[in-house]
Interface confidence: medium
């Protein structure tokens, strides 16, 4: 099928980096500046992403990809392959309405993205706090006080902080 | 195919409330940010508002900082714009959006329009 | 926030080329959206990133961005391409800012 497609088809055999220019007989034209064709086949090469404005550029176009964007210091990306950019706050705060702001006493927030998360309630697990929560850390739970004997062992780890999600715009 | 209708407009007098609601449908409405854009009779455009796809983040332009709030409910795919302390500034057509961003459409609802009078 | 400034009003004759400016700081180095919007209708975008078209626009419909200036550009323009159209620009963070409005009327 494939070889009976490129006989009908001179454009199949056109790489990827080249479009099937239809202006001159069907030949493989090279992508011009500035764009891209990440298949064969193509008609029509891509336009490549600009990273402007806070975003910045994670990986220069080529003319068989696109080019890819991060955010700028200060900016962490959201959405499917960083359709935007947010503002970081501070381990410590959440960035709410009114800009960053620090986390209300019994939550915590160990990253700069994200909303502070109320510290880990150890009594529910039958054990007491070890080392106190602050706005950046989650408390640590260490054994109930009947369990300290001899040989008792170890600190539960706090549990993994939860990324939240990202949409895009 | 993605869809937008806002609704709850309608005239109001200075100080007062009012709760506008934006029903989206042909997209997975928590996947995305969505915005509130407004336009004065016979003026331009200005950007209201933007929550993010979870509702964890809102932002606000000056004009309405302290008096709207955006909220959603992801479960019944609705947008929300809690406006109080209205004046006749206020007054204008309402639209829900899903604003361009890299890779994404650009999708607007018909608008609902908020009369601001005593 | 940046401002954005467009003339209030352009006119063209039919079959003429309108150009219809956006200006504000710097504003080649964000990205910058077009929209037509008729009487009594939502916004339609006709520009995204500065030069891109949404599909469904026609071809007569092209963009620039470039140093303080963004240029929507109108070929061959068309009884019903007469619309108010503004300017939108964005950095990739979350807020947006529009232009004031031009009025384009085909004489």
């Known amino acids: 099928f494939e070889r009976t497609r490129s006989l009908q088809d001179p454009c199949s055999n056109c790489p990827a980096g080249t479009f099937c220019d239809n202006n001159r007989n069907q030949i493989c034209s090279p992508c011009p500046p500035n764009s891209f064709s990440s298949a064969g086949g193509q008609r029509t090469c891509d336009i490549c992403r600009q990273c402007k404005g806070v975003f910045r550029t994670r990986k220069e176009c080529s003319s068989t990809s696109n080019a890819e964007c991060d955010c700028t210091p200060g900016f962490h990306c959201l959405g499917a392959g960083c359709s935007m950019c947010e503002q970081d706050c501070k381990q410590g705060q959440e960035l709410t309405k009114k800009g960053c702001k620090d986390c209300c006493f019994g939550t915590f927030n160990d990253q700069k993205r994200g909303i502070c998360r109320p510290w880990t309630n150890c009594s529910l697990d039958g054990k007491s706090v070890l080392v106190n929560g602050t706005k950046e850390r989650d408390v640590v739970c260490g054994p109930s006080p009947a369990d300290l004997s001899p040989g008792a062992s170890s600190v539960t780890p706090p549990a993994p902080a939860r990324e939240p999600g990202h949409s895009p715009q | 195919q993605v869809q937008l209708v806002e609704s709850g407009g309608g005239l109001v007098q200075p100080g007062g409330s009012l709760r506008l609601s934006c029903a989206a449908s042909?997209?997975?409405?928590?996947?995305?940010?969505m915005h509130w854009v407004r336009q004065a009779p016979g003026k331009g455009l200005e950007w209201v508002s933007v929550?993010?796809?979870?509702?964890?983040?809102?932002y606000y332009a000056d004009s309405v900082k302290g008096r709207f709030t955006i909220s959603r409910d992801n479960s019944k795919n609705t947008l929300y714009l809690q406006m109080n302390s209205l004046r006749a500034e206020d007054t204008a057509v309402y639209y829900c959006?899903?604003?361009?961003?890299?890779?994404?459409?650009?999708?607007w609802g018909q608008g609902t329009l908020v009369t601001v009078s005593s | 926030d940046i401002e954005l400034t467009q003339p209030p009003s352009v006119s063209v004759a039919p079959g003429q080329t309108a150009r219809i400016s956006c200006s504000g700081d710097?504003?080649?180095?964000?990205?910058v959206s077009w929209y037509q919007q008729k009487p009594g209708q939502a916004p339609v975008l006709v520009i995204y990133?500065?030069?891109e078209r949404p599909s469904g626009i026609p071809e007569r419909f092209s963009g620039s961005n470039s140093g303080n200036t963004a240029t929507l550009t109108i070929s061959g323009t068309q009884a019903e391409d007469e619309a108010d159209y503004y300017c939108?620009?964005?950095?990739?963070?979350?807020?947006?800012?529009f232009g004031g409005g031009t009025k384009l009327t085909v004489l």
């Open positions: 990133s500065d030069s």
């Open positions: 929550i993010s796809g979870s509702g964890s983040n809102t």
């Open positions: 710097n504003i080649g180095s964000k990205y």
């Open positions: 042909g997209f997975t409405f928590s996947d995305y940010y």
């Open positions: 959006a899903r604003l361009y961003a890299q890779f994404e459409g650009d999708f």
């Open positions: 939108q620009s964005w950095d990739g963070s979350i807020s947006r800012v």
